[in-house]
């Protein structure tokens, strides 16, 4: 004979010795019907705040308050947001490795410094874990056939450099 607890809906509990579906008491939930007990609702307070409230059929979901981020499955811990020069990993905030940077507060990943030489430019300012490299103007390499003429432009004292 099928136990009548099997017909119980989520949001209820049922004991085998008295197979009657009963509503979960306040601050408890059951996402599966027919269980002998309802689960105690999660509470989101302190560094946590509610992303979802607990109902009779689902648990509360928490997130971290501003300036903090979640760690662990279902946001079990809150950790202070990463500073510029760091990135968030599974182990928490880690300093950017040499040659990478992150200029964002709380978010973002460490990105490689710009390679100035790819654009034919020199490094004007070296990068840090928080700031990218600053590239200088393009390096003009003069070949033997290059001629330079300075021509007046736009009135007295105005000159422009023309690379021919």
């Amino acid at each position: 004979v099928q136990n009548s607890c099997d017909n119980c809906q989520p949001g209820t509990f049922c004991r085998k010795y008295n197979p009657v579906c009963k509503s979960c008491p306040p601050s408890t939930f059951s996402s599966i019907g027919g269980q002998p007990n309802c689960n105690i609702c999660r509470v989101c307070a302190g560094y946590f705040r509610f992303k979802k409230f607990c109902s009779s059929t689902h648990n509360a979901e928490c997130e971290c308050i501003e300036g903090f981020h979640c760690l662990g499955p279902q946001c079990t811990r809150c950790e202070k947001d990463c500073r510029p020069g760091q990135e968030l990993t599974k182990q928490g905030c880690k300093t950017c490795s040499l040659g990478t940077f992150n200029d964002q507060n709380g978010t973002g990943v460490c990105r490689p410094w710009t390679n100035c030489s790819l654009d034919g430019r020199s490094v004007l300012k070296t990068g840090t874990t928080e700031k990218d490299v600053v590239c200088g103007p393009p390096v003009v390499s003069f070949s033997p056939s290059t001629t330079i003429s300075v021509t007046p432009e736009g009135g007295p004292g105005g000159h422009s450099l023309q690379v021919l």
């Epitope: 601050s27 609702c41 307070a45 992303k51 979802k52 009779s56």
Partner: antibody, heavy 114, light 106 residues
Framework: QVQLKCAGPGLVQPTQTLSLTCTVS????????VHWIRQPPGKGLEWMGI????????YFLSAIKSRLSISRDTSKSQVFLKINSLQTDDTAMYYC???????WGQGVMVTVSS | DIVLTQSPTTIAASPGEKVTITCRAS?????MYWYQQKSGASPKLWIY???KLASGVPNRFSGSGSGTSYSLAINTMETEDAATYYC?????????FGSGTKLEIK
Amino acid sequence: QVQLKCAGPGLVQPTQTLSLTCTVSGFSLTSDGVHWIRQPPGKGLEWMGIIYYDGGTDYFLSAIKSRLSISRDTSKSQVFLKINSLQTDDTAMYYCARIHFDYWGQGVMVTVSS
Amino acid sequence: DIVLTQSPTTIAASPGEKVTITCRASSSVSYMYWYQQKSGASPKLWIYDTSKLASGVPNRFSGSGSGTSYSLAINTMETEDAATYYCQQWSSTPLTFGSGTKLEIK
């Protein structure tokens, strides 16, 4: 900055459907839920329900639940409240609020009368 | 549903006086939340997580309690504190409010 603006008709006839809109700015509906709360004239606050960041909803488990629906349009940053088969005791100030109740709309007064 | 019973319904206090409003829950809740509402205005979150003051709330206000018994206190009443105060629980839906306490100036 965070703002919620409620809009809807001031006067609705009994048995008709009430449609209210809450337009939010300063936060995303895909990150934060929005509540609807109402307050009959001279009375207390009654929580009606919430639409969550993922579109899921929770409603007040009372007689009104069967007449109530909350939905949203994330592209327009709007949350909607619909109540059908309106009764005179649905006359109230209707508010929307962000999930943490830290920001509330200015409210819209709805009178149900023929 | 968790029923919240506030007392008193109305209270009149003179400036400088200490005021206490209580909120009793029909079953245990983890934290209590309080709102202030002035006539013709939207409610404002006043106290959260039982005892934390919301942004801009003067520190003459305090909140305390646990289980089924909670309270909001004003150390020294000021005229601007005249308003209606509501308690609310977030432990489980439906989220319920107390019926309100109207605080008037004597």
